[in-house]
């Protein structure tokens, strides 16, 4: 019989008492085969973290700073359940740490040196740890003691709870630095008042502070937020302009064998029976013998943290950077305007080979990081392990939802001004063999399908979006008799036609021979009835242009396109017979790397781009023998985006809407995780 006990860790007598009450009340409402609670008492949160890691306890609820500690080796814990605040309809699981300034003050984030600062309190998250952690490498050396470095960075501050004797500058704006509401500039409202009164130039608070203190929009409009990219935004745009997004209070468990499903089952049932306004006898979010025992008193319920989300992703790049800077205190030798090498994310060993070749030719400008799937690469870029990669539009959408930004677009047509003119896009098509003359768009049911990969534009999002509109369900594996759609569940009929061996079967990378445009076309040639690819795929792989044994004798005339009106046309008539226009592939990165990725890639394409004529004796960035490694092989240049510099603007309203509609069919664990952070 599986053990269905969750051992909750308590850190005080009062918590232990509430835990026992929790245990007893759960027993009274949950059947004997359901989850149960046991209580383990430890002296501190850090002891609880160690106990969970050692399998002496299973769960504890932690503030963000402790979630970071819990994630560090050797603890390796992960977030499994989040408390939420506000309403069930609009649950808030995160708050945003922001830097608020007066509208007319005219400086940016990188110009804070010498300004006057207002903090909620020394050592507090939004008011101190996050802003000071992010500014850490700009502080004057020596950076220890930290208070002295901060005092020397700003021209005056109010940092309640600081030592006014040792660091008088930190108390210059609020004499005494009192550590309670007796100090008018203490806490969130106090720090904002410090700004409002004109004592300080910037207040480090949370996003809700300004709304709680200024009910009137006209008053709020006198203030702005400083963004990390050295711009400003209105105060209601905090989701796009903050220092960090911070989880409020989170249940953590072991990463391996951590009982996360059981913990969720327990807490979900607990909130049903003992959540807000549920029971008089026992209340989960109430602490008669103290404050915030086991859970925050202000919590309204729990949400399950998506399983794909580890602590780094949950806490977010900015928060992890800030806390790591504060804890480890390491900075580059001297801050320079030089760009660090761009860490390119390569998919599987084929891309890694090409990336290694690029790296040595780039003389240190490019470094390589490997991952097995596109989603793993996106996650690595999010958390700073990698910096950039070029993505199909479907993944630009996921990357955008995960906070990444497009920085350059692949262009496929030769033009005089290639780098300055991003193209409208390419065509997604459905290709069939000419010999299968009865096949049309309207009778694909039961046929064998070939897809570039799940989640990609021409191979999946466009054809499956159109199909979904017709069949109104997501069971595409039942619509087609079998197929190859790399990235599908291994037991799905949409992996049946794939050719990868062993563990590589149906993998969404080049180890699966039917992956990508060329792979999907090969699947059609060898096994399938229809391939969903781009309009250039057939000409690029016929007429001897692809020398691989399977392709060298193919003739373009032996293939036709399916049109949406039920007719068929020759391959060259793609402009009048396609499924939709697809946005070109684009390079994505984190916002903080945008300028450097742009600069280095433009240098790299000038060295190794289409201007290189002999690719047998020189490195060519946009060539890989029809395998589309790192970039599409038909890329002519990487083009500036001008104002299309967000994923929505880049992909266009129509495509974003189409992918949004298909979201209900999504199997992307990363998309689920990212929409948890930003619904």
């Amino acid at each position: 019989v599986p053990d269905k006990t969750v051992r909750w860790c308590a850190v005080s007598e009062h918590e232990a008492t509430k835990c026992q009450s929790f245990r007893d009340h759960m027993k009274s409402v949950i059947p004997s085969d359901g989850p149960s609670v046991a209580c383990v008492k430890k002296a501190s949160y850090l002891d609880c973290i160690r106990a969970i890691a050692a399998n002496e306890a299973d769960a504890v609820t932690l503030d963000a700073g402790l979630v970071y500690d819990a994630y560090l080796a050797p603890n390796n814990l992960k977030p499994v359940v989040a408390e939420f605040y506000g309403s069930k309809e609009d649950p808030q699981t995160f708050y945003y740490a922001v830097a608020v300034v007066k509208k007319d003050s005219g400086f940016q984030m990188n110009q804070l040196r010498g300004k006057k600062s207002c903090h909620t309190g020394l050592g507090r998250s939004a008011g101190w740890n996050i802003p000071i952690g992010l500014l850490y490498c700009d502080l004057p050396e020596p950076r220890k003691p930290l208070e002295k470095a901060v005092a020397n960075f700003f021209s005056g501050s109010c940092a309640p709870c600081a030592d006014g004797t040792d660091f008088p500058q930190l108390c210059q704006l609020c004499p005494g630095c009192g550590c309670s509401t007796l100090n008018q500039y203490f806490g969130y409202s106090g720090a904002f008042k410090c700004l409002k009164d004109g004592a300080g130039d910037v207040a480090f608070v949370k996003h809700s502070t300004i709304f709680e203190n200024l009910a009137n929009k006209a008053d709020r409009d006198q203030y702005e937020l400083l963004c990390l990219d050295n711009t400003r935004k209105p105060v209601d745009e905090y989701k796009d302009c903050h220092l960090a997004q911070v989880p409020s209070h989170t249940v953590v468990a072991r990463s391996m064998g951590g009982k996360e499903d059981l913990i969720w089952e327990l807490l979900n049932q607990a909130q049903e029976h003992f959540g807000k306004d549920k029971s008089k006898e026992f209340q989960l979010f109430s602490s008669p013998h103290g404050k915030d025992l086991l859970f925050k008193d202000s919590a309204h319920g729990f949400l399950k943290v998506p399983p794909r989300m580890d602590a780094k992703m949950y806490l977010g790049y900015e928060y992890v950077t800030a806390i790591r800077n504060l804890r480890e205190g390491t900075c580059p030798e001297a801050p320079t305007d030089e760009c660090k090498p761009v860490k390119w994310c390569a998919l599987s060993h084929h891309e890694r080979l090409k990336c290694d070749e690029w790296s040595v030719n780039s003389v240190g400008k490019i470094e390589c990081v490997s991952a097995e799937t596109t989603e793993d690469c996106i996650a690595k870029i999010m958390n700073g392990e990698a910096d950039a990669m070029s993505l199909d539009g479907g993944f630009v959408y996921i990357a955008g939802k995960c906070g990444l930004v497009p920085v350059l677009a692949e262009n496929y047509n030769k033009s005089d001004n290639c780098e300055d003119t991003p193209e409208a896009g390419y065509f997604a098509i459905a290709v069939v063999k000419k010999s299968a003359s009865d096949l049309t768009w309207d009778n694909l049911k039961g046929k064998k399908s070939c897809h570039t990969a799940v989640g990609r534009t021409a191979g999946w999002n466009i054809p499956m979006g159109l199909l979904y509109n017709k069949i109104n369900h997501c069971r595409f594996d039942e619509f087609f008799s079998e197929g190859c759609a790399p990235g599908s569940k291994k037991d799905s009929s949409l992996c049946k036609l794939c050719m990868g061996s062993g563990l590589n079967l149906c993998e969404p990378n080049n180890k699966e021979g039917y992956y990508g445009y060329t792979g999907a076309f090969r699947c059609l040639v060898e096994k399938g009835d229809v391939a969903f690819v781009k309009h250039q795929t057939v000409p690029q792989n016929t007429g001897g242009k692809n020398p691989d044994p399977w392709a060298k004798n193919l003739n373009e005339k032996d293939y036709e396109l399916l049109c949406l009106d039920g007719t068929r046309k020759p391959v060259e008539e793609y402009a009048n017979c396609h499924l939709a226009r697809a946005p070109n592939h684009a390079v994505v990165t984190r916002k903080d790397k945008e300028a450097c990725v742009h600069k280095i890639l433009r240098q790299q394409q000038h060295l190794f781009g289409s201007n290189v004529t002999d690719c047998s004796g020189n490195f060519c960035l946009f060539r890989s023998e029809t395998k589309d490694l790192l970039f599409r092989d038909d890329t002519v240049c990487l083009a500036k985006l001008h104002d299309r510099n967000t994923y929505e603007k880049y992909l266009g309203e129509e495509y974003v809407k189409a992918v949004g509609n298909l979201r209900k069919c999504s199997t992307s664990s990363l998309l689920e995780a990212c929409t948890f952070r930003r619904p």
Epitope: L353, E357, V360, N361, S616, G617, F619
Partner: nanobody
């Protein structure tokens, strides 16, 4: 397309040295980039070092300061000088000229290096 043959591997004690050679069947003068990879038991093949025609080099962090890559275009040979060898350097070492056959996983036999006392 030139064929490449690796040699020079063997059994060596920790702290010892070896020099691997990669001989090409034709001219390597026109080959821009060449590299050494290794595959440890149960692991993916990984870059050890690479060198361009112009002499730019790149090393894996784990071998920096201990290994040195060079090429002699006149002798159509590339070398990997391996010093201060460690047990974790035990692997089959392969050379590559980054031509299209490597995208087809068409690697040579490699040369076995074993570091053990």
């Amino acid at each position: 397309q030139v064929q490449l043959v690796e040699s020079g591997g063997g059994l060596v004690q920790p702290g010892g040295s070896l020099r691997l050679s990669c001989a090409a069947s034709g001219s390597i003068f026109s080959i821009n980039t060449m590299g050494w990879y290794r595959q440890r038991p149960g692991k993916q093949r990984e870059l050890v070092a690479a060198i361009t025609r112009g002499g730019n080099t790149n090393y894996a962090d784990s071998v920096k300061g201990r290994f040195s890559i060079s090429r002699d275009n006149a002798k159509n040979t590339m070398y990997l000088q391996m010093n201060s060898l460690k047990p974790e350097d035990t692997a089959v070492y392969y050379c590559t000229d980054y031509s299209r056959r490597y995208y087809q996983d068409d690697w040579g036999q490699g040369t076995q290096v074993t570091v053990s006392s």
